[in-house]
């Protein structure tokens, strides 16, 4: 991953929320659901609507980075998801407000959203060789790749 | 006792449309994913689209993508797959089905069919 003094130089400014209200789920088709208060895991649900529902926010770097840079929020709520390091589950982080500013040891908050298709790779802007992944009993985590399953498809509300 | 009941195929031609029913009994309809799947004369089972227990969140095969809408009442217990832009190789019988979004097998419960021919 890139070093950290690296990253710290770089500001990351509030847009706006460009997404309400999906689902993610994963090659599988497993819905990423609440496995506690602070974690989140993955499972086929008999029905969608049980899913946790994310909102996205996006940020513009100073660095001027051509990549779409994300804070994912658990909608109707102030839980944020955060990342760790490889293989370590990501934390739902309680904060009263979207960050205004992200800089330094708080760019564990961003993702980098890549789009390829139908599939959605989300790329921790601090570990950015690590994505969001599922993996199997585990929790969603951050994982460079294979056995995890990196790649997700959204489900957008159609109401 | 589940049952599920399709209707609405039929001969159409290419770039024609058609509107599939599924009338659901015997489950509390608002709590489950439904889904349409197909199987194509001499082929496997494809599925092709699956709606939430509210509606709010749907998703499609790629083969059909912006050509067919899922939807349910569930006031109705009712669920409708409308088919636009209908193709030669939409040719099939569709199934509705309940369960899970992906197991093996994926559904619990489907019905007998309705046959849609798309030829000219």
């Known amino acids: 991953s890139a070093p950290f003094s690296f990253l710290s130089n770089v500001k990351y400014n509030f847009m706006r929320i460009i997404k309400y209200e999906f689902i993610l789920n994963d090659a599988l088709n497993q819905s990423i659901i609440r496995a506690n208060d602070q974690y989140l895991t993955a499972a086929a649900l008999h029905n969608l609507d049980e899913a946790v529902k994310f909102d996205m926010g996006a940020y513009k770097s100073s660095k001027d980075d051509a990549k779409i840079t994300v804070i994912l929020r658990i909608s109707k709520t102030q839980l944020y998801v955060t990342a760790q390091d490889e293989d370590q589950p990501v934390l739902l982080k309680e904060m009263p407000e979207i960050p205004k500013t992200i800089t330094g040891s708080e760019t564990n908050l961003l993702f980098f959203w890549e789009t390829h298709g139908t599939k959605n790779y989300f790329t921790s802007v601090a570990h950015p060789n690590l994505f969001i992944a599922t993996k199997q009993d585990y929790w969603v985590c951050l994982a460079g790749g294979p056995p995890s399953i990196t790649d997700f498809q959204i489900l957008e509300n159609q109401a | 006792e589940v049952q599920l009941l399709e209707s609405g195929g039929g001969l159409v031609q290419p770039g024609g449309s058609l509107r599939l029913s599924c009338a659901a009994s015997?489950?509390?309809?608002?709590?489950?994913?439904m889904f349409w799947v197909r199987q194509a004369p001499g082929k496997g089972l494809e599925w092709v689209s699956v709606i939430s227990g509210s509606g709010r969140f749907t998703y499609y095969a790629d083969s059909v993508k912006g050509r067919f809408t899922i939807s349910r009442d569930n006031s109705k217990n009712t669920l409708y797959l409308q088919m636009n832009s209908l193709r030669a190789e939409d040719t099939a019988v569709y199934y509705c089905a309940k369960g899970w979004w992906r197991r093996d097998p994926p559904f619990d419960y489907w019905g007998q069919g309705t046959l849609v021919t798309v030829s000219s």
């Open positions: 015997g489950f509390t309809f608002n709590q489950y994913n």
